[in-house]
């Protein structure tokens, strides 16, 4: 016999990302003896909760909690039994619940209470279900991206930690109901609400962040639909040959379409709406989502929101990735420059329904929404955030880094479990278990 060194014990953490359109569960793991190291926490597994987001259960809160059961049962299998009690479990809800909280705070509270009741039934260390602010969603996404890409600190060959010279990456998240932009900036923000000061591993970071509610992909599509009904009677962003029955109650139930809601409308009425494959009218429709008329600061992105000039490299994830990936992979279109992105959006918007279906087979009706989605992403980046060709060259569209989904969930867990210390790590001897 010979002595065999056992691998280090693993610790686990679970985050339920309760988005506007669906909920995802992420299970993270890390070696127990290296808790303060950077880049050491990784994704162990994930699970997509069937059905809509928890905000869609406003009239049936118990349905929200019931929907989580399948993934929670999977978590019981994925996390070793002896680790259950020590595994923190968090639920964070984002813009879908922020919207519900605006329109129906009682329903929002009921949904959170219902999911809390279910989550406490499991043997994990449940640490709460809450609605994240837009600022938190942006910052935690930024933390996730930079943690995974090891931009905060690294362990060098000489046995000491150092801060990489390459600086941090900006983060852009496009969710279902909101979109966030977050990046490190040198000068103080003119709008204090857009600035966050962070202390990570002994380093100080001044970060600009803003979340635009109602500018997530799904809400943008609803707003464009409302505009199309109002101004055209046809949808310029939908492909010619595609038509569907639109339930007015669905279009106008969101606070995001309140401004376009007619005085008197029958919520149960259905209107037939057809596409016209008109990229120019579609671009005009999308442009209407952004206001550049007034800015109370030295410079703004849109809607009077302060934003310093975009600087450095960025990672764009969630629906940014899915939209650009669709153009690149499914449509076979180049998207390496802003000009190419615009041309790709125009190309998709020119397609008839027959052409689009032939190019991308076996898809549900939301295939018809890729034109609007592409046009919105292109306009948001170029006109909204002010990326020029040079700055756009520094944007990478990514879904995962180091086999871990990029999003706010990991950053949220790292923060709440104190896995990123504020102080610099001291020198410590490492043990190689390979």
């Amino acid at each position: 016999t010979r002595d065999v060194r056992e691998p280090p014990a693993l610790k686990y953490g679970i985050v339920l990302d309760a988005g506007s359109s669906h909920t995802s569960m992420f299970i993270y793991k890390w070696p127990a003896d290296k808790e303060n190291d950077t880049g050491i926490v990784g994704q162990h597994s994930s699970c997509d909760v069937p059905g809509g987001g928890i905000s869609s259960y406003a009239d049936n809160p118990s349905g929200a909690s019931q929907s989580l059961v399948g993934c929670l049962e999977q978590a019981l299998q994925d996390v070793p039994k002896e680790r259950h009690a020590g595994t923190p479990l968090y639920l964070g809800a984002t813009a879908g619940m922020r919207l519900l909280n605006l329109t129906n705070p009682e329903a929002s509270t009921s949904v959170l209470m219902a999911v809390t009741h279910t989550l406490t039934q499991y043997p994990f260390d449940f640490r709460g279900a809450r609605i994240l602010s837009g600022q938190e969603e942006g910052v935690f996404g930024w933390v996730t991206a930079n943690y995974l890409l090891e931009n905060f600190i690294k362990y060098g060959w000489v046995g000491r930690w150092f801060r990489p010279r390459k600086g941090t990456l900006g983060a852009m998240d496009l969710g279902g109901a909101s979109t966030q932009i977050t990046f490190e900036t040198t000068s103080p923000a003119e709008d204090r609400a857009s600035e966050v000061q962070l202390h990570l591993y002994g380093q100080h970071y001044r970060v600009y962040t803003h979340s635009f509610l109602c500018y997530g992909r799904d809400q943008v599509l609803q707003r464009l639909l409302a505009s199309a009904l109002q101004t055209h009677g046809f949808h310029p962003c939908w492909p010619r040959g595609f038509s569907t029955q639109v339930l007015l109650g669905d279009v106008y139930q969101s606070p995001c379409t309140m401004a376009q809601r007619p005085q008197n409308f029958n919520s149960s009425a259905r209107v037939s709406l057809s596409g016209s494959s008109d990229p120019h009218l579609c671009r005009d429709l999308v442009s209407g989502l952004f206001s550049f008329s007034s800015c109370p600061f030295s410079r703004c992105s849109f809607n009077g929101v302060f934003q310093p000039p975009v600087a450095g490299n960025f990672v764009a994830f969630s629906a940014f990735f899915y939209t650009v990936d669709f153009l690149r992979t499914s449509m076979g279109l180049p998207v390496a420059t802003l000009q190419q992105l615009e041309a790709a959006a125009v190309n998709v918007c020119n397609q008839t329904w027959a052409q689009l279906q032939a190019r991308v087979p076996g898809q549900r009706a939301r295939l018809a929404d890729y034109c609007a989605g592409a046009m919105f992403v292109q306009q948001l980046l170029s006109r909204g955030y002010g990326f020029d060709e040079r700055a756009f060259g520094g944007v990478i569209f990514q879904k995962k880094a180091a086999d871990t989904a990029v999003g706010w969930a990991l950053g949220y867990m790292l923060n709440l479990t104190n896995l990123i210390p504020a102080d610099p790590p001291g020198l410590r001897k490492g043990t190689d278990f390979s």
């Epitope: 997509d48 069937p50 990936d325 669709f326 992979t329 499914s330 076979g332 027959a354 052409q355 279906q357 032939a358 190019r359 991308v360 087979p361 076996g362 898809q363 549900r364």
Partner: antibody, heavy 120, light 108 residues
Framework: QVQLVQSGAEVKKPGSSVKVSCKAS????????VSWVRQAPGQGLEWMGR????????RYAQKFQGRVTITADESTSTAYMELSSLRSEDTAVYYC?????????????WDQGTLVTVSS | SYELTQPLSVSVALGQTARITCSGD??????VYWYQQKPGQAPVLVIY???NRPSGIPERFSGSNSGNTATLTISRAQAGDEADYYC???????????FGGGTKLTVL
């Protein structure tokens, strides 16, 4: 009633190429697409790539990228699949399948397939 | 990359109901197609868009799809239903058709 008719069985040496044809008899490729799917002996179905002749649009499975070329001649309603750098693992029945708009471009008409044997 | 998982084999008594599953991440968000393949023959489309039958396919064949599982149901199974069954779905992320590994249905 559209039928697909493929070329006959082939025996090829490792390292060589094979080109299989698929003709739509009793119809054209207008509004249709053609996929190529292979099946190794005793194995499952494996999608290789597709072409939308009327759009000149092709897509290939990553596994075959750079090794497979799918083309179509609209005038003769014939699709072709060429696979290069053949190895013994490429021994399989190669099917062409029509993708129809009526079925959201899933495979509604298949030919009986072409057996390609790769052997030294 | 996206994968579809099927049981290797399913057995059913003559006249009873057979259920063949096909699982994949959030498969309920995609359309699923089912193909029947008998020995020495080309595959035949039996279900498209989750639950629709092409003309000529008996009503005994039906499909469903939600969450992470799609199911092909064959009621009143007959000896002639013995075959390999494949589910398929289009993977938007890699722009490719994906087939499940196939399920051998045996009618006892």
């Amino acid at each position: 009633q559209v039928q697909l008719v493929q070329s006959g069985a082939e025996v090829k040496k490792p390292g060589s190429s094979v080109k299989v044809s698929c003709k739509a008899s009793g119809g054209t490729f207008d509004s249709y697409a053609v996929s190529w799917v292979r099946q190794a002996p005793g194995q499952g179905l494996e999608w290789m790539g597709r072409i939308v002749p009327w759009l000149g649009f092709t897509r290939y499975a990553q596994k075959f990228q750079g090794r497979v070329t799918i083309t179509a001649d609209e005038s003769t309603s014939t699709a072709y699949m060429e696979l290069s750098s053949l190895r013994s693992e490429d021994t399989a029945v190669y099917y062409c399948a029509r993708e129809s708009p009526g079925y959201r471009y899933s495979f509604d008409v298949w030919d009986q397939g072409t057996l390609v044997t790769v052997s030294s | 990359s996206y994968e579809l998982t099927q049981p290797l084999s399913v057995s059913v008594a003559l006249g009873q109901t057979a259920r063949i599953t096909c699982s994949g991440d959030a498969i309920g968000e995609k359309y699923v197609y089912w193909y029947q393949q008998k020995p020495g023959q080309a595959p035949v489309l039996v279900i498209y868009d989750d639950n629709n039958r092409p003309s000529g396919i008996p009503e005994r064949f039906s499909g469903s799809n939600s969450g992470n599982t799609a199911t092909l149901t064959i009621s009143r199974a007959q000896a002639g239903d013995e075959a390999d069954y494949y589910c398929a779905s289009y993977d938007l992320q890699q722009a490719r058709w994906v087939f499940g590994g196939g399920t051998k249905l045996t009618v006892l």
